[in-house]
Interface confidence: medium
């Protein structure tokens, strides 16, 4: 990384948690001095090129499509910029996860799913037949990897004190430390509703 330049960004245009055979679009921030942008996957500390874009004067941020997602395409991605023959800059890294490689865990709650702000709820993710050593809890619609992780089995995720932003549909995934980008099928979904008017009648549609 050169001098005091800010690190260019890399981002997924949709969720980085991708079902087997699904697709995702990756965007590399354009930097003025680069004549070539390459998307690289980092496997075992080795870089492998996934795609490249030559710079055009009218170009916006270069985009790359990863389709037919599978175990080999899951992992850490980085944009590599060629500044000159022997000069490079690199973006931050992006982690892509593939789901559907193991059977699904089961997600349950320790109380009703309609809450008032400030209340607590615990979600439990368990798998009776598959000995996962890690679980992740994901909220539908989020564009980053789930922040909630647990190494317990079953995994308890404490949400709270909750605010209105906690409302949403949650699923959990199981995975193994040795293969952190290969996740299970999603669990059953639980919809949490946080409302400051508990008298409303909440019904959820599938």
């Amino acid at each position: 990384q050169e001098g005091d330049f800010p690190m260019p960004f890399i981002s997924a245009k949709s969720s980085p948690v991708i079902p087997l055979d699904g697709s995702v679009k990756i965007q590399c921030q354009a930097i003025r001095e680069a004549y070539l942008t390459q998307l690289m996957i980092i496997k075992n500390s080795t870089y492998r090129e996934i795609g490249r874009r030559l710079k055009f004067w009218n170009e916006t941020d270069p985009e790359f499509v990863i389709d037919h997602m599978d175990a080999n395409k899951a992992g850490r991605y980085q944009c590599q910029y060629r500044i000159g023959h022997y000069r490079f800059r690199y973006s931050d890294t992006l982690e892509l996860v593939v789901t559907g490689l193991y059977g699904k865990p089961f997600l349950s709650a320790d109380r009703g799913l309609v809450l008032m702000p400030g209340e607590n709820i615990s979600l439990t993710c368990s798998s009776a037949h598959i000995p996962f050593d890690r679980f992740s809890l994901a909220k539908e619609g989020e564009l980053s990897l789930p922040q909630h992780q647990s190494g317990e089995h079953p995994a308890n995720f404490s949400l709270g004190p909750v605010d209105l932003n906690v409302s949403g549909i949650y699923r959990c995934y199981g995975w193994y430390n040795r293969s952190p980008y290969l996740w299970s099928f999603p669990s059953n979904a639980l919809e949490l509703v946080v409302t400051d008017s508990i008298h409303q009648d909440y019904t959820t549609q599938n």
Epitope: L20, D70, A71, N72, G100, L101, Y102, G103, K104, A128, H129, I130, P131, W175, Y176, S179, L182, F185, N188
Partner: antibody
Framework: QVQLKESGPGLVAPSQSLSITCTVS????????VHWVRQPPGKGLEWLGI???????SYNSALMSRLSISKDNSKSQVFLKMNSLQTDDTAMYYC??????????WGQGTLVTVSA | DILMTQSPSSMSVSLGDTVSITCHAS??????IGWLQQKPGKSFKGLIY???NLEDGVPSRFSGSGSGADYSLTISSLESEDFADYYC?????????FGGGTKLEIK
Amino acid sequence: QVQLKESGPGLVAPSQSLSITCTVSGFSLTSYGVHWVRQPPGKGLEWLGIIWAGGSTSYNSALMSRLSISKDNSKSQVFLKMNSLQTDDTAMYYCARDHYDLFAYWGQGTLVTVSA
Amino acid sequence: DILMTQSPSSMSVSLGDTVSITCHASQDISRNIGWLQQKPGKSFKGLIYHGTNLEDGVPSRFSGSGSGADYSLTISSLESEDFADYYCVQYAQFPRTFGGGTKLEIK
């Protein structure tokens, strides 16, 4: 095109063990799990177990003590081993590729007869 | 284990008919059900997963419906190639369990 093909011994003596190989093509075992299912003559289907793409296994608890499933990703082969066979283990044994937690593609099956 | 009760066990129907096969699970399986077809002398083929979704290449005359513990497979305008055995299978829990099968025969 996705294909699975089972190969087994045909005849097994009672109390002996069974080994069946499922050789797959058209997909990678690092991306898809493989189930084993059997069907005794004139009877229904029974799920035996699965080896997931990541390598872990899930078994039918009724058979777990004598069942083992493994694989060799590089050879595109999945292996079923069952110990202490009895006559009621006589069945057609199938392997099937997992898809969305279910069975999408099946092999033709291999008939295993347990008899002295 | 979840018990899958499939009916009827056999039925005689004519070309062009519409038929429905039902499966009842011993508990709510939340659409975690699939349907399989086995043609005479052939292996099995997946038709439907997650209750209603057609596997690739399956004709649209096949459809699945249901919720909770009760599900059905409907075949409209039966064609000669549809005469086969059909099975439901649940994957809400381990072990996976199958219905007893339905044999479709030509009347």
